[in-house]
């Protein structure tokens, strides 16, 4: 039984990074709700003075790809492509270290924004990571 669906990205907030590419959604009508959540999150991020340029340059597309993961076209069943673990770790530990610390201690941000957990992603050299999304 299929757990989710592959459908063209129909929003606008992440269109610059995703275009009309096919994304994985857990239900057919989930896109709209996630679009509303991510625009609310971006508004909050933009209002915050805690986000550096070097972080936002990579964090924004990463959040888009995390919220709207590309479909794995090599799979016979609908399946999302993961972010690449090495890039996720660079983002969390180097480029956005201060921002992550702030975000993880801020309930308002956590409520609106699901941050990727790098430890959940496959190891760089594993077969599962071969098709990961590079920012």
């Amino acid at each position: 039984e299929e757990d989710g669906f592959c459908q063209p990205y129909r929003g606008i907030a992440c269109a610059r990074f995703i275009g009309n590419r096919t994304v994985y959604m857990e239900s057919l009508h989930m896109q709209g709700e996630i679009e509303n959540q991510i625009t609310a999150a971006f508004t909050m991020i933009g209002t915050s003075s805690h986000l550096s340029d070097k972080c936002s340059q990579f964090a924004i597309p990463s959040l888009c790809h995390y919220a709207f993961p590309y479909c794995d076209e090599t799979s016979s069943v609908p399946k999302p492509r993961d972010l690449c673990r090495d890039e996720c770790e660079i983002l969390e530990n180097v480029l956005c270290q201060t921002e992550y610390i702030f975000a993880r201690s801020n309930p308002m941000i956590l409520m609106r924004l699901k941050l990727p957990n790098c430890e959940d992603l496959p190891q760089p050299e594993s077969p599962e990571a071969a098709n990961c999304i590079r920012i």
Partner: antibody
Framework: EVQLVESGGGLVQPGGSLRLSCAAS????????IHWVRQAPGKGLEWVAA????????RYADSVKGRFTISADTSKNTAYLQMNSLRAEDTAVYYC??????????WGQGTLVTVSS | DIQMTQSPSSLSASVGDRVTITCRAS??????VAWYQQKPGKAPKLLIY???SLYSGVPSRFSGSRSGTDFTLTISSLQPEDFATYYC?????????FGQGTKVEIK
């Protein structure tokens, strides 16, 4: 108070260009998608284009793709619609509107664009 | 593109009447439908979003409902200020599309 004010409309010859402006106030401009919707005289509403200023992401109707360009200047809280290669069928009142949970909750008063020789 | 077929194109009604306007989507749009009211020479005003959510400040006599790909705007008791043109709009996918409009006139 949320406000959207369009300007830049006028009479232009076929093949000509025009740039419309939409000045926004009363809300966090970059966090909302801004749309342009037009209405030909005596006709219905037609969605034209949209921009999400925070990521500079854009979308266009097929009828204007390649001729119109939507942009935004977050320092001025203003969205623009650059219209090139104008045709008679582009004659309409052009409204800018703010996206609220993906419906349009605030609209400007509209600006008339007339394409005629 | 998703087509929104609105009916009727016009109707005549009296103050106090119950008025129903329907929109049919050419494919599934979930509940991503809004309804607007427009008066001559004015910008449209949002009435309903997400098929049935009443927008802030809109009188409760306006309501929206969904049944599959059919969407309905109901005015429970028509008031003099309700005579206008009404449009439905889908926002599940770009390009966003509007219905052709329904003009509500005084009988």
């Amino acid at each position: 108070e949320v406000q959207l004010v369009e300007s830049g409309g006028g009479l232009v010859q076929p093949g000509g260009s025009l740039r419309l402006s939409c000045a926004a106030s009363g809300f966090t401009f970059y966090g909302y998608t801004i749309h342009w919707v037009r209405q030909a005289p005596g006709k219905g509403l037609e969605w034209v284009a949209a921009i999400y200023p925070y990521t500079d992401s854009t979308r266009y109707a097929d009828s204007v793709k390649g001729r119109f360009t939507i942009s935004a200047d977050t320092s001025k809280n203003t969205a623009y619609l650059q219209m090139n290669s104008l045709r008679a069928e582009d004659t309409a009142v052009y409204y800018c509107a703010r996206d609220y949970r993906r419906a349009l909750d605030y609209w400007g008063q509209g600006t008339l664009v007339t394409v005629s020789s | 593109d998703i087509q929104m077929t609105q009916s009727p194109s016009s109707l005549s009604a009296s103050v106090g009447d119950r008025v129903t306007i329907t929109c049919r989507a050419s494919q599934s749009v979930s509940s991503a439908v809004a309804w607007y009211q427009q008066k001559p020479g004015k910008a449209p005003k949002l009435l309903i979003y997400s098929a049935s959510s009443l927008y802030s400040g809109v009188p409760s006599r306006f309501s929206g409902s969904r049944s599959g790909t059919d969407f309905t705007l109901t005015i429970s008791s028509l008031q003099p200020e309700d005579f206008a043109t009404y449009y439905c709009q889908q926002y599940t996918d770009f390009p966003w599309t509007f219905g052709q409009g329904t003009k509500v006139e005084i009988k």
